[in-house]
Interface confidence: medium
């Protein structure tokens, strides 16, 4: 019998609001796992050190991820 695991997603609530890449301190993508069945995207904002949870399905967030990865690839040698 498999051990029952507590579902431990980090995010309390998820935002669909667009995020200005300039206000971002850091962006973390946590893949789905045995502890949390969904992908979690955590954006650390420069103001307040606030950690926002972004909706991976939102068009605005998908665009943000594209912009951030584009910016990263520009910076990498």
């Amino acid at each position: 019998v498999p051990l029952s695991r507590t579902v431990r997603c980090t995010c309390i609530s998820i935002s669909n609001q667009p995020v200005n890449p300039r206000s971002l301190e850091k962006l973390e993508i946590i893949p789905a796992s045995q502890f949390c069945p969904r992908v979690e995207i955590i954006a650390t904002m420069k103001k307040k050190g606030e950690k926002r949870c972004l909706n991976p399905e939102s068009k605005a967030i998908k665009n943000l991820l594209k912009a951030v990865s584009k910016e990263r690839s520009k910076r990498s040698p």
Epitope: T10, C11, I12, K48, K51
Partner: antibody, heavy 122, light 110 residues
Framework: QVTLRESGPALVKPTQTLTLTCTFS??????????VIWIRQPPGKALEWLAR???????HYNTSLKTRLAISKDTSKNQVVLTMTNMDPVDTGTYYC??????????????WGQGTTVTVSS | QSVLTQPPSASGTPGQRVTISCSGS????????VNWYQRLPGAAPQLLIY???QRPSGIPDRFSGSKSGTSGSLVISGLQSEDEADYYC???????????FGGGTKLTVL
């Protein structure tokens, strides 16, 4: 079930350094988006936030107390330690640790410890 | 002196509706959300309301929150004897760049 428990000396002499430990269970500070914060309440006064540490070891301090505070974590022991130097009788009060989770705003503490009372007196 | 102002005490009889106010300014409640905490006698504080009007799971719907301008309100409808506790509001202050709290309201159920 998430629990947090504060421990430390009940009595501290003026000018001494206070060391408080928050031992928690039910979550891990290795998980992205988790944070632990220290808050205090002097008798008859409002709650006041002191310091916060994030899973990525980012540290935030109350500006007015920044020079006296240091926060650290030991993820293997599930503990967060707060040190406060140069203690004064006005630092007497109940000290709490609490948990912050991503997605709820930077001042939403969804689980708290019972608090530990610290008296500063010679 | 607290940054957020709450009445020191409030009271009501079982079944009544009680409102606790939390007054701030444009730099805190005016531009940020309000949260409410309950501290029962001898217990750890607990989150009652976050983001102005959101209830965490497990909090009865007798508790509700709202925000208007630079003030927040906590409403307890159908007051019960176990609601006797201290209630605190909290927000973020852009000028102080930190979390701020109200002085607390002691609620007595008569």
């Amino acid at each position: 079930q998430v629990t947090l428990r504060e421990s430390g000396p009940a009595l501290v002499k003026p000018t001494q350094t206070l060391t408080l430990t928050c031992t928690f269970s039910g979550f891990s500070l290795t998980t992205s988006g988790m944070s632990v914060i220290w808050i205090r309440q002097p008798p008859g006064k409002a709650l006041e936030w002191l310091a916060r540490i994030d899973s990525d070891d980012e540290k935030h301090y109350n500006t007015s107390l920044k020079t006296r505070l240091a926060i650290s974590k030991d993820t293997s022991k599930n503990q967060v330690v707060l040190t406060m130097t140069n203690m004064d009788p006005v630092d007497t009060g109940t000290y709490y640790c609490a948990r912050l989770r991503a997605g709820s705003g930077p001042y939403v503490f969804d689980s708290w410890g019972q608090g530990t009372t610290v008296t500063v007196s010679s | 002196q607290s940054v957020l102002t709450q009445p020191p005490s409030a009271s009501g009889t079982p079944g009544q509706r009680v409102t606790i106010s939390c007054s701030g300014s444009s730099s805190n409640i005016g531009s940020n959300t309000v949260n409410w905490y309950q501290r029962l006698p001898g217990a750890a504080p607990q989150l009652l309301i976050y983001n102005n009007d959101q209830r965490p799971s497990g909090i009865p719907d007798r508790f509700s929150g709202s925000k208007s301008g630079t003030s927040g309100s906590l409403v307890i409808s159908g007051l019960q004897s176990e609601d006797e506790a201290d209630y605190y509001c909290a927000s973020w202050d852009d000028s102080l760049n930190g979390r701020v709290f109200g002085g607390g309201t002691k609620l007595t159920v008569l």
